[in-house]
Amino acid sequence: FGISGRHSITVTTVASAGNIGEDGILSCTFEPDIKLSDIVIQWLKEGVIGLVHEFKEGKDELSEQDEMFRGRTAVFADQVIVGNASLRLKNVQLTDAGTYKCYIITSKGKGNANLEYKTGAFSMPEVNVDYNASSETLRCEAPRWFPQPTVVWASQVDQGANFSEVSNTSFELNSENVTMKVVSVLYNVTINNTYSCMIENDIAKATGDIKVTESEIKRRSHLQLLNSKAS
């Protein structure tokens, strides 16, 4: 039956988010084939007439590629043979958000899976002691967020406490007039405590922790993309 065989193959995608102005990865894996020349990968986007990307017979085939993706896409050619059809996307834009389809043909059959791709801006926060302030104050800064996130402070000692009355958050538009710098200040902090600054929008959640003791300051931060579910 060759590539026109009746069988369907398993194709798996993972919903993901792209950070605007950076590289993005649209993840897709499939049951591998032993011959690269028998594998066809097509990436499509809902509402877009041309293809996002096509890879067949061991190389990119871009004659049907939509202009909005020209020069912005590539598969990991050396990993296709092991079942990786993921797509690298250059300079992610807000308009790249949407539903993508990863469509695969191999000698074993064909299959496809959809992927929801969100776009925005997210960055790691950094929490520092603000020595310029008159009282014990913490300052949480994150350089790039979009859409506008919420900022919540928490403390290890005062779990469940509401810090909205003793904190002040501002959003400053960056020079490109899209993303914003997030600055949040927490007042009246106590020593020997760990404070967390949590920044969240519908794309990502980031946390910056600071532990202040008599002798040292320890910092830690992490970022998690939301809605990363496989399909």
Partner: antibody, heavy 121, light 107 residues
């Protein structure tokens, strides 16, 4: 090893055209964009445009649109830059360069040796 | 079109000095900034791409940083072979653009 070998120096009269070639080897020619950059004597680098040999798609600096034509011959793995209506200000070293990232247009990571084009009456 | 404004246009430094060169994009924002080194009569050489990724084989004294519209190339300890002209390149958009160049000379 990626290699880009350019054609030799040219002397042209104002109003004439010049065609510079760039022969690629050491990689799959049709899978990577090739760009053209020029440098006038004592001046900086100026991006002219680029081509994706796999499909012949091109991009041009607005300044050169209508005067520069970038083409390729996949059978010989060669890219070409043709510049018409030459003037003295076009006297420069013309470089071809491979763009990193295959079908993804990356930075220029491998360069030809350059071709000096002199425009003089 | 995006323009890249590079500064300074030239600088004098000594071996061992820390050197910083900056490029400012006229608009937009993305991480697609590369840095090149060029010596007289030679083709440019890629040092750094995607703001801060060092090209294989390039010494670690070269580093890149930046975000938004402002980007920086730093040479932590200038070596004799580093005296050259440096260019930034914006390659995120359809139209690429180089900075005007910075000539690093011996003091």
């Amino acid at each position: 090893e990626v290699q880009l070998v350019q054609s030799g120096a040219e002397v042209k009269k104002p109003g004439a055209s010049v065609k510079v070639s760039c022969k690629a080897s050491g990689y799959t020619f049709t899978s990577y964009w090739i760009g053209w950059v020029r440098q006038a004597p004592g001046q900086g680098l100026e991006w002219i445009g680029d081509i994706y040999p796999g499909g012949g798609y091109t991009n041009y600096n607005e300044k050169f649109k209508g005067r520069a034509t970038i083409t390729r011959d996949t059978s010989t793995s060669t890219a070409y830059l043709e510049l018409s209506s030459l003037r003295s200000e076009d006297t420069a070293v013309y470089y071809c360069a491979r763009l990193d990232g295959s079908s993804y247009r990356g930075a220029m990571d491998s360069w030809g040796q350059g071709t000096l084009v002199t425009v003089s009456s | 079109d995006i323009q890249m404004t590079q500064s300074p246009s030239s600088l004098s430094a000594s071996v061992g000095d820390r050197v910083t060169i900056t490029c400012k994009a006229s608009q937009g924002f993305n991480k697609y900034v590369a840095w090149y080194q060029q010596k007289p009569g030679k083709a440019p050489k890629l040092l750094i791409y995607y703001t801060s990724t060092l090209q294989p084989g390039v010494p670690s004294r070269f580093s890149g940083s930046g975000s938004g519209r402002d980007y920086t190339l730093t040479i932590s300890s200038l070596q004799p072979e580093d005296f050259a002209t440096y260019y930034c390149l914006q390659y995120g958009n359809l139209l690429y653009a180089f900075g005007q160049g910075t000539k690093v000379e011996i003091k």
